[in-house]
């Protein structure tokens, strides 16, 4: 058993049929010694008396808010949560496996630049009685500070018969140099509590590996005289690290119709302009990627050909 | 410690081309190592990230773009003395800071070159003959060093009398390649910045 936060405790249980469970001793936070009784949740049934209560925790029915009273007055609470371990593996029932970039990916994180700011998100089908708490650091043995905000519900989607909820959190490394060469990864830890179930999820990464620039901005087309070609130009996204001559991007320019199956024109360039063949009913799209360290491409920025 | 704005004329910077070749060569070599040593811990997640130049050179600080010198977090610089002459510098326009930066890059290359050559000598003794260093990568390191053209003491190649542990050598190769790729990215960024300034 360990303390998650004040008056909230996590009991780690090996979860299998007829498991013996864990013996837990609760102590009432009071100077009083006599006349103390214990109850669980909203029940008025007295579970025991005395300053300490010893319970055998085997299942979710044994978890919950234990309260010690004296003469009708509440003295203190202890909330017991369960963390299940099945076949030596901690349960991951609360969050959905996003399977990208690999199986057992519950947390996904991205950074728009090298400033040390990043966003992580996760998915769940659970809509109520759900809380998250996020901590992060650079390295684990001698951790350096990373500050995370509160996790918020950022999107709701319908997936077949199910509703899916996306939560996200923004974090910022306390003292980040955009030009630094990372040797220790960022660690992100998410505590998830659903009703009386506790789970924790972690992710470890270098900012350089989670870079995904914003799409290029200000796409413009200039038809070329006596030709089917057009010159397309764009600018670096505002959120990208500066100076741009140091943090350079490379671009992919594509002309394609509405369907992915349609024919296309595609060219890669390090410049902020390119010449392509425009077709009726097609769009010109441009996306960006770090020129020197190939992490993710940005989303496409698009303009219609016509 | 930063790069000044007064740097060589555009297109007059022979090191840019060599640094692009360097990044390409080390990336290819790392990819090859990851494929060949698939049953060894050779991915970014599996290895320890070590920097053999730590406390010996200070390339990131010495080559910091002017725009980042206002960032306190970028200025935990280490004092290191460097030799200051070189042919990538556009003669009179060269500043002391830029010489310091390029000299630091040269020292990095020299250190990695020695490590790679020592390692290759060990790998050539491996009866499995599983992996060797790409001669192209070693040649590209050499070309960039020649383009930088700094005079510095030659570092003797480390020789070892004991029987090499090939498993450890291959893991060290992965560690070295990962670190060198990161440094090659920094070098490429620096050369691009200098070329554009």
């Amino acid at each position: 058993i360990w303390e998650l936060k004040k008056d909230v405790y996590v009991v780690e249980l090996d979860w299998y049929p007829d498991a013996p469970g864990e013996m837990v001793v609760l102590t009432c936070d009071t100077p009083e010694e006599d006349g103390i009784t214990w109850t669980l949740d909203q029940s008025s049934e007295v579970l025991g008396s005395g300053k300490t209560l010893t319970i055998q925790v085997k299942e979710f029915g044994d978890a919950g808010q234990y309260t010690c009273h004296k003469g009708g007055e509440v003295l203190s609470h202890s909330l017991l949560l369960l963390h299940k371990k099945e076949d030596g593996i901690w349960s991951t029932d609360i969050l959905k496996d996003q399977k990208e970039p690999k199986n057992k990916t519950f947390l996904r994180c991205e950074a728009k630049n090298y400033s040390g700011r990043f966003t992580c998100w996760w998915l769940t089908t659970i809509s109520t009685d759900l809380t998250f708490s996020v901590k992060s650091s650079r390295g684990s043995s001698d951790p350096q500070g990373v500050t995370c905000g509160a996790a918020t519900l950022s999107a709701e989607r319908v997936r077949g018969d199910n509703k899916e909820y996306e939560y996200s959190v923004e974090c910022q490394e306390d003292s980040a140099c955009p030009a630094a060469e990372e040797s220790l990864p960022i660690e992100v830890m998410v505590d998830a509590v659903h009703k009386l179930k506790y789970e924790n999820y972690t992710s470890s990464f270098f900012i350089r590996d989670i870079i995904k620039p914003d799409p290029p901005k200000n796409l413009q087309l200039k038809p070329l005289k006596n030709s089917r070609q057009v010159e397309v130009s764009w600018e670096y996204p505002d959120t990208w690290s500066t100076p741009h001559s140091y943090f350079s991007l490379t671009f992919c320019v594509q002309v394609q119709g509405k369907s992915k199956r349609e024919k296309k024109d595609r060219v890669f360039t390090d410049k902020t302009s390119a010449t392509v063949i425009c077709r009726k009913n097609a769009s010109i799209s441009v996306r960006a990627q770090d020129r020197y360290y190939s992490s993710s491409w940005s989303e496409w920025a698009s303009v219609p050909c016509s | 410690r930063n790069l000044p704005v007064a740097t060589p004329d555009p297109g007059m910077f022979p090191c840019l081309h060599h640094s692009q070749n360097l990044l390409r060569a080390v990336s290819n070599m790392l990819q090859k190592a990851r494929q060949t040593l698939e049953f060894y811990p050779c991915t970014s997640e599996e290895i320890d990230h070590e920097d053999i130049t730590k406390d010996k050179t200070s390339t990131v600080e010495a080559c910091l773009p002017l725009e980042l010198t206002k960032n306190e977090s970028c200025l935990n610089s280490r004092e290191t003395s460097f030799i200051t002459n070189g042919s990538c510098l556009a003669s009179r326009k060269t500043s002391f800071m830029m010489a310091l930066c390029l000299s630091s890059i040269y020292e990095d290359l020299k250190m990695y070159q020695v490590e790679f050559k020592t390692m290759n000598a060990k790998l050539l003794m491996d009866p499995k003959r599983q992996i060797f260093l790409d001669q192209n990568m070693l040649a590209v390191i050499d070309e960039l060093m020649q383009a930088l053209n700094f005079n510095s003491e030659t570092v003797p190649q480390k020789s070892s009398l004991e029987e090499p542990d090939f498993y450890k050598t291959k893991i060290k190769l992965c560690i070295l390649l990962h670190a060198f790729r990161i440094r090659a990215v920094t070098i490429d960024r620096v050369m691009s910045y200098l070329n554009a300034s």
């Epitope: 199956r261 349609e262 024919k263 296309k264 595609r266 060219v267 390090d270 063949i277 077709r279 009726k280 | -």
Partner: antibody, heavy 118, light 107 residues
Framework: EVQLVQSGAEVKKPGATVKISCKAS????????LHWVRQRPEKGLEWMGW????????EYAPKFQGKVTITADTSTDTGYLELSSLRSEDTAVYYC???????????WGQGTLVTVSS | DIQMTQSPSSVSASVGDRVTITCRAS??????LHWYQQKPGKAPKLLIK???QSISGVPSRFSGSGSGTDFSLTINSLQPEDFATYYC?????????FGGGTKVEIK
């Protein structure tokens, strides 16, 4: 299977015109760009131009502008290359090539040898 | 027009050898470069697109690298069926242009 089948070899006199064909099968003809590439004896490859069979748009290499005409007939899934004012240096194998992407060549015809000789 | 220069123009090698062919562009073309193999009396065949992207059905011993002006095609362990002429082609701008070719011959 995506395939391009070209017409047979031609022998022409200098000054004449020749029209060679390239019949597409295994895909929707208008879904791919169609290119023509020349290869002179013991020489390399030269790109001549492309057509978008969907709308008839064409683009020619400056070197071949006025010399060649590329057309396409969507009713027969066939592309054509017409070479005019033939000279001995036009003796070559002419390949048609197709791709959904405009700038490189995924599928090739077997080639048509055009010999210009008096 | 962008000139593409291949080297060497021919190379003699044995089965099992590692062969590298290079291609240089007269100006920077990013990764807009493709490689083809041509056997005598046959049409060219696409091997690699956009400098390093593999093509399905092409053996993994063929790999490409490069960007900007310098590119290379590597055949890792030469097989009897690999003796052919190899061409690079730039797609950075029209007109599309090819290198002069590199003939890989049996030693």
């Amino acid at each position: 299977e995506v395939q391009l089948v070209q017409s047979g070899a031609e022998v022409k006199k200098p000054g004449a015109t020749v029209k060679i064909s390239c019949k597409a099968s295994g895909y929707t003809f208008s879904d791919y760009y169609l290119h023509w590439v020349r290869q002179r004896p013991e020489k390399g490859l030269e790109w001549m131009g492309w057509i978008d069979p969907e709308n008839g748009d064409t683009e020619y290499a400056p070197k071949f502008q006025g010399k060649v005409t590329i057309t396409a007939d969507t009713s027969t899934d066939t592309g054509y290359l017409e070479l005019s004012s033939l000279r001995s240096e036009d003796t070559a194998v002419y390949y048609c090539a197709a791709n959904k992407e405009l700038r490189y060549f995924d599928v090739w015809g077997q080639g048509t040898l055009v010999t210009v000789s008096s | 027009d962008i000139q593409m220069t291949q080297s060497p123009s021919s190379v003699s090698a044995s089965v099992g050898d590692r062969v590298t062919i290079t291609c240089r562009a007269s100006q920077s073309i990013s990764i807009n470069l493709h490689w083809y193999q041509q056997k005598p009396g046959k049409a060219p065949k696409l091997l690699i697109k956009f400098a390093s992207q593999s093509i399905s059905g092409v053996p993994s011993r063929f790999s490409g690298s490069g960007s900007g002006t310098d590119f290379s095609l590597t055949i890792n362990s030469l097989q009897p069926e690999d003796f052919a002429t190899y061409y690079c082609q730039q797609s950075n701008s029209f007109p599309l242009t090819f290198g002069g070719g590199t003939k890989v011959e049996i030693k």
